[in-house]
């Protein structure tokens, strides 16, 4: 058991151009607070996946009002550390998310409004008991400077807080086979009498006779890897003969979730859905009150004035979970049109539009012809994110800039001769044919196949095509 501690040193504009606007104003004074979320291992999970190692909220910082015309300075911070207690072994590698939240203190109906200013995330290796580690993370134009460490709670010691120490029974030295507890030289390492056969690499115990597993291992002796191979059986230890998995104990066998939590298997391990008032990887953390700020993402905490009375988190729209720690998948309603990609940013939905579409929901089919002139009297035709020109007679090409040879396609039938003309083409028909393209035969008796020849034209005259 132990505590992860986070100390925020500063939050303000990062170096370089494009300083952010102050988040507060004279009309809307505000104050900051921070949330930290920890997950074991070097996971790259989404921000809203469970904070399996734990989470904490800071106190609210001092009220800040922007000075008109002044650049955004480093903003006033809450006092104290953010502390995330962990009951199990410290995993050594962890992922963190640190969120900077703004609480607006204007005249909003229904109390203050919360909004996420910045979120930074990272993956680190850290041994418990080591010195403070310093870090700088940037989120857009903001910069966050902080330090962190993991420390064991007595009687636990060691880089994973799995060794136990007890006060010396004799003043001079420890018992046979027991080392002094660095850095507590006046204490001795307690003999860990775990369940017989408990894996020394993957198991540990805090009470005599138990065998508790590190993440990724399961079974009564912590010898069964949680991950599975590509065989048909969903879980279990490898079979030496086939290399495949044979049925064995699953991660939810025996229900590792404490305090009435329900267990569900995940591809890599298990997840506990905790009853209200409990959280942590195994629902083991309790005694939480509203003063501890257990509701994330702007959730409103009611009740829970003392550790014996349960609190309730009233989640803002879009969040769920007993601590408002999970985001509802609003993108499943597919609000983006025309094949746009939906992104749920928490404070808003965003659509990434396909080429040729724009607007908050990709609802606008871009006017492909805007600013696209078709030359020489051509007209622009739009569609499908592209444009094309319908050219006037005698012109061609993408923008109707090329002069077309109207005779190139040999439009005059029955041996008629084609002449290019400023307004198109003219066919001089061979004897016995007439029409704009010489398409009509003239009958031997002088009558044509047409009802009547146009006035002023004799069969055989050149026909101009308009």
């Amino acid at each position: 058991a132990g505590v992860f501690e986070l100390q925020i040193h500063s939050f303000g504009p990062g170096p370089g151009p494009g300083a952010p606007r102050s988040p507060c104003s004279a009309r809307l004074p505000c104050r900051l607070f921070f949330r930290v979320c920890l997950k074991p291992g070097l996971s790259e999970e989404a921000a809203e996946s469970p904070c399996a190692l734990g989470a904490a909220l800071s106190a609210r910082g001092p009220v800040y009002t922007e000075q008109p015309g002044a650049p955004a300075p480093d903003l006033p911070l809450p006092d104290g550390l953010l502390q995330v207690p962990f009951r199990d072994a410290w995993p050594g590698t962890f992922s963190f998310i640190i969120e900077t939240w703004r609480e607006e203190l204007g005249d909003q109906i229904g109390g203050p409004a919360w909004s996420l200013l910045a979120r930074v995330a990272g993956r680190r290796r850290l041994a418990a008991g080591g010195p403070w580690a310093r870090d700088i993370q940037r989120a857009g134009a903001w910069e966050l400077r902080f330090s962190y460490r993991a420390r064991c709670e007595p009687p636990a010691v060691g880089t994973a807080c799995t060794r136990l120490c007890r006060p010396r029974s004799a003043p001079s030295r420890c018992g046979p086979g027991l080392r002094p507890c660095a850095p507590l030289e006046d204490e001795c390492e307690a003999p860990l009498v775990c369940r017989a056969g408990c894996s020394p690499e993957h198991g540990f115990c805090e009470q005599p006779g138990e065998c508790r597993c590190l993440e990724g291992w399961t079974g009564p002796l912590c010898t069964v890897p949680v991950s599975t191979s590509s065989c048909l059986s969903p879980r279990g230890p490898s079979s030496a003969t086939t290399g495949c998995l044979v049925p064995g104990p699953g991660p939810c066998d025996g229900n590792p979730c404490a305090n009435g939590g329900s267990c569900s298997e995940t591809p890599r391990s298990f997840e506990c859905t905790c009853p209200r008032g409990f959280y942590g990887l195994r629902c083991e953390v309790s005694g939480v009150t509203c003063a501890d700020g257990p509701c994330f993402n702007g959730g409103l905490c009611v009740g829970g004035a003392d550790p014996d009375s349960a609190y309730i988190c009233h989640c803002p729209p879009g969040f769920q979970g007993s601590n408002c720690e999970k985001r509802v998948d609003r993108c499943s309603l597919q609000p983006c049109r025309n094949g746009g990609l939906c992104l749920d940013l928490g404070h808003a939905l965003r659509c990434r539009c396909r080429a040729g579409f724009a607007g908050p929901r990709c609802e606008h089919d871009l006017d492909d012809c805007a600013g696209r002139a078709c030359a020489n009297g051509g007209t622009c035709v739009e569609g499908g994110g592209a444009h094309r020109c319908s050219c006037a007679l005698g012109f061609g090409g993408r923008d109707c800039r090329e002069r077309a040879d109207p005779c190139a396609a040999r439009p005059c039938a029955h041996g008629g001769r084609c002449y290019a003309h400023f307004s198109g083409l003219v066919c001089a028909c061979a004897p016995g044919y007439m029409g704009a393209r010489c398409e009509f035969p003239v009958h031997p008796d002088g009558a044509s196949a047409l009802p009547a020849a146009p006035p002023g034209l004799r069969p055989g005259d050149p026909q101009r095509y308009l």
């Epitope: 609003r330 597919q334 609000p335 983006c336 049109r337 929901r361």
Partner: nanobody
């Protein structure tokens, strides 16, 4: 401000039917997408059925063939006709809408929820 008001929830026996209604009101210029989510105790909130931004109809696999979503554009209302109800359909059903406001901004809104209980 936009309000989504659900109605029609209640208790029904397995195999029975219910019809939920959700009416949107307020400073709405247009409704882009609208549908129904549900949340069973201890479970994540999940989409049940909806009209997408493109106007298509989508359903969760578990309700296909049993639930039908419809709408009345003139009344800014969507309906969920639920038939052949099962015990696992027990949940709080929430109306959700992605709305374009008079300001031309888009906002996503939730209703307060209506409880559907299926038990013998």
């Amino acid at each position: 401000e936009v309000q989504l008001v659900e109605s029609g929830g209640g208790e029904v026996q397995p195999g029975g039917s219910l019809r939920l209604s959700c009416a949107a009101s307020g400073s709405i210029l247009s409704i882009n997408a609208m549908g129904w989510y549900r949340q069973a105790p201890g479970k994540q909130r999940e989409l049940v059925a909806g009209f997408t931004g493109d106007g298509n109809t989508i359903y969760a696999e578990s309700v296909k063939g049993r639930f039908t979503i419809s709408r009345d554009n003139a009344k800014n209302t969507v309906y969920l006709q639920m038939s052949s109800l099962r015990a696992e359909d027990t949940a709080v059903y929430y109306c959700a809408a992605d709305v374009q406001l008079f300001s031309r901004d888009y906002e996503f809104y939730w209703g307060q929820g209506t409880l559907v209980t299926v038990k013998p």
